[in-house]
């Protein structure tokens, strides 16, 4: 089949923009650390890079292959407020490179970590 | 309490970077439109802007207040392959402005649309 060059160019552009790579995301700190429901952070979210985007097949998953750590200071507030905000220092995993990996490999990796 | 200026500056920066605003995201086309499991798109994902980020309170939700529509041409593949990829033109919602809205208001809004 012969396809319009414009269509092919725009499709190629979409592939590039949606590929598996580190992307700036907002992380909800409370959810990330699963803290008690009366513990809040200000700001509630931080910006870090995490692997994201799409892989070319259903059986693949976008996973980090290398990670750096970013240190950020936030305020922690516990309610009822018996004292003011307390500073907490958090080291956030920041994905620096990513790869589309087989979901089976990812599953094996996780389970070998558990079994180790 | 007296806090270090550097800490306050970095916290302010985090607030700005994580605020509720349109953000470039990857949308899985098949999931977005809930197509049949034997229908695939190439590329499987497209890049659009959707509201995201954090609001200052648990009771608020980052919601779109205006939307434009982007037309994108992709290839649709149906298996078993009786024919080659077919170009399809899909219109995607692209959020152009956002606001932190009360979850109650969002709920009311959704339910008033349903009831109409």
């Amino acid at each position: 089949a012969h396809y319009n060059t414009e269509i092919l160019k725009s499709i190629d552009n979409e592939w590039r923009k949606t590929q598996c790579m580190p992307r700036e995301v907002c992380i909800d700190v409370g959810k990330e650390f699963g803290v008690a429901t009366n513990t809040f952070f200000k700001p509630p979210c931080v910006s870090v890079y995490r692997c994201g985007g799409c892989c070319n097949s259903e059986g693949l998953q976008c996973m980090n292959t290398s990670t750096s750590y970013l240190s950020k200071t936030l305020f922690e507030i516990t309610v009822p407020l018996s004292q003011g905000p307390k500073p907490v220092t958090i080291s956030f995993a920041n994905h620096t490179s990513c790869r589309c990996m087989s979901k089976l490999d990812v599953y094996r990796q996780v389970h070998s970590i558990i079994r180790r | 309490a007296h806090y270090n200026t550097e800490i306050l500056k970095s916290i302010d920066n985090e607030w700005r970077k994580t605020q509720c605003m349109p953000r470039e995201v990857c949308i899985d086309v098949g999931k977005e439109f809930g197509v049949a499991t034997n229908t695939f798109f190439k590329p499987p994902c497209v890049s659009v802007y959707r509201c995201g980020g954090c609001c200052n309170s648990e009771g608020l939700q980052c919601m779109n207040t205006s939307t434009s529509y982007l037309s994108k041409t992709l290839f649709e593949i149906t298996v078993p392959l009786s024919q080659g990829p077919k170009p399809v033109t899909i219109s995607f919602a692209n959020h152009t402005s956002c606001r932190c809205m009360s979850k109650l208001d969002v709920y009311r809004q959704v339910h008033s649309i349903i009831r109409r």
Epitope: K31, E32, F33, G34, V35, A36, T37, T67, Y69, I90, S91, F92, A93, V110, I113, I114 | -
Partner: nanobody
Framework: EVQLVESGGGLVQPGGSLRLSCAAS????????MGWYRQAPGKQRELVAA???????LYADSVKGRFTISRDNSKNTLYLQMNSLRAEDTAVYYC????????????WGQGTQVTVSS
């Protein structure tokens, strides 16, 4: 259902060290976010340290540089190494875990007493 059992608390002199352990039952341990809270008599429970499955760590500024959180996924155990202990670290230390499934939930241990006194 996840069960958590803390151990390692006790009486220690100021400047001393203790290592708290939190053993978890259940599978998928490495996928949990986990951490430690403490509660001193008449005070509110406060967050001490936490860690995620992705390797992020959190420390309250009052313990930063003195306490270290770590986990051994092969033993399903979370640790809190506490050095240079002070009288103000006296509290009951609680381990928690957070399962981020379809129904997110916190699970808590029964606590272990740490007393710092000369």
């Amino acid at each position: 259902e996840v069960q958590l059992v803390e151990s390692g608390g006790g009486l220690v002199q100021p400047g001393g060290s203790l290592r708290l352990s939190c053993a978890a039952s259940g599978s998928m341990f490495s996928m949990y976010a986990m951490g430690w809270y403490r509660q001193a008599p008449g005070k509110q429970r406060e967050l001490v340290a936490a860690t995620t499955s992705g390797g992020s760590t959190l420390y309250a500024d009052s313990v930063k540089g003195r306490f270290t959180i770590s986990r051994d996924n092969s033993k399903n155990t979370l640790y809190l190494q506490m050095n240079s202990l002070r009288a103000e670290d006296t509290a009951v230390y609680y381990c928690y875990t957070y399962w981020r499934g379809s129904d997110p939930e916190n699970y808590w241990g029964q606590g272990t007493q740490v007393t710092v006194s000369s």
